[in-house]
Interface confidence: medium
Amino acid sequence: ESALITQQDLAPQQRAAPQQKRSSPSEGLCPPGHHISEDGRDCISCKYGQDYSTHWNDLLFCLRCTRCDSGEVELSPCTTTRNTVCQCEEGTFREEDSPEMCRKCRTGCPRGMVKVGDCTPWSDIECVHKESGTKHSGEVPAVEETVTSSPGTPASPCSLSG
């Protein structure tokens, strides 16, 4: 969880909503799944599937649940104590510092290079030069040599996995 909480992360709630459970803060903090009331006297539960809090806190609002983008699958839903966990669809990735959509992983390395890192939901395969061991720039090569025997590449009739 990021310690930085921005305004768009917050999901305003009606403090007096009758369906929300209340309890008293402990040393000024409310437990996971709750936020503190404006007067600091009550802990109010987050709304399941809408917002959450993961730690003991003194937040005035719970954090808004993430919605998975198209091209992503939901690994686990948002609950009152944990955010949604999303992942790029099979064989695609999105770098953490990039806001772009999930992109397809390459299926192999250019000639003269070997694969040292697998396709993951947040990184393309990693290639290094056979001789120097230096990393490839990441540009998709014009000619690719599919590495069928390495783990993490799409299975094919000639792969070890069968």
């Epitope: 969880e1 993961t54 730690h55 699958v73 939901e74 690994l75 686990s76 944990r82 966990v85 992942q87 669809e89 099979e90 064989g91 953490e96 890192g117 697998d118 396709c119 993951t120 939901p121 947040w122 990184s123 783990p151 993490g152 590449t153 799409p154 299975a155 792969s159 070890l160 996995s161």
Partner: antibody, heavy 121, light 107 residues
Framework: EVQLVESGGGLVKPGGSLRLSCAAS????????MNWVRQAPGKGLEWVSS????????YYADSVKGRFTISRDNAKNSLYLQMNSLRAEDTAVYYC??????????????WGQGTLVTVSS | DIQMTQSPSSLSASVGDRVTITCRAS??????LNWYQQKPGKAPKLLIY???SLQSGVPSRFSDSGSGTDFTLTISSLQPEDFATYYC?????????FGPGTKVDIK
């Protein structure tokens, strides 16, 4: 109830082969990535191999690459580990473990009870 | 490969104590860290996944903090059933790697 039950462990000589099986029940097996994790006697946990829900993506630890093959049969709710060219250092309890509902493993849950593989002459 | 280290390797504590276990990755793994509990002769049990998501049924006394390379598992008030070995594991890059474990025993 979600359950994973391993079988196929036993005593084998160095250079020999074994095939481990894991029978899954209580969840939609075909939607989840699956894994094998092992633990040598008195030691810590070591990840062995993972397979995506559709079998399209397969990963192995360097220590078993080229010797072990993971596979699954979604119609039978079963996971397999074919172990060839076994070595003494492969001696361990082998656990079958569920993964996330995505193609790339991540966390391991639930776990089977484990099956002991002993490689000794 | 990403190496995972844990400290301490073992600790003795009493029921009611606040216990902290540290896990460090050899390179940034963002928040892709999971924690497991294992009791002797039993299979491991997932406690926390994706750094901060408490697995269903796990008591709220377990919590995780940190991101990047440094993570902490905290048990706010140790209970008798918490005496066990705890492992961290990164799922950022294959090969997935575990820490060597931290054994928590009775003082």
């Amino acid at each position: 109830e979600v359950q994973l039950v391993e079988s196929g462990g036993g005593l084998v000589k160095p250079g020999g082969s074994l095939r481990l099986s894991c029978a899954a029940s209580g969840f939609t097996f075909s939607s989840y990535s699956m894994n094998w994790v092992r633990q040598a006697p008195g030691k810590g946990l070591e990840w062995v191999s993972s397979i995506s829900s559709s079998s399209s993506y397969i990963y192995y630890a360097d220590s078993v690459k080229g010797r072990f093959t993971i596979s699954r049969d979604n119609a039978k709710n079963s996971l397999y580990l074919q172990m060839n060219s076994l070595r003494a250092e492969d001696t361990a309890v082998y656990y079958c473990a569920g993964g996330s509902s995505g193609w790339y493993g991540g966390w391991f849950d639930p776990w089977g009870q484990g099956t002991l593989v002993t490689v000794s002459s | 490969d990403i190496q995972m280290t844990q400290s301490p390797s073992s600790l003795s504590a009493s029921v009611g104590d606040r216990v902290t276990i540290t896990c460090r990755a050899s390179q940034s793994i963002s928040g892709y860290l999971n924690w497991y509990q294992q009791k002797p002769g039993k299979a491991p049990k997932l406690l926390i996944y994706a750094a901060s998501s408490l697995q269903s049924g796990v008591p709220s006394r377990f919590s995780d903090s940190g991101s990047g390379t440094d993570f902490t598992l905290t048990i706010s008030s140790l209970q008798p059933e918490d005496f066990a070995t705890y492992y961290c594991q990164q799922s950022y890059r294959t090969p997935f790697t575990f820490g060597p474990g931290t054994k928590v025993d009775i003082k």
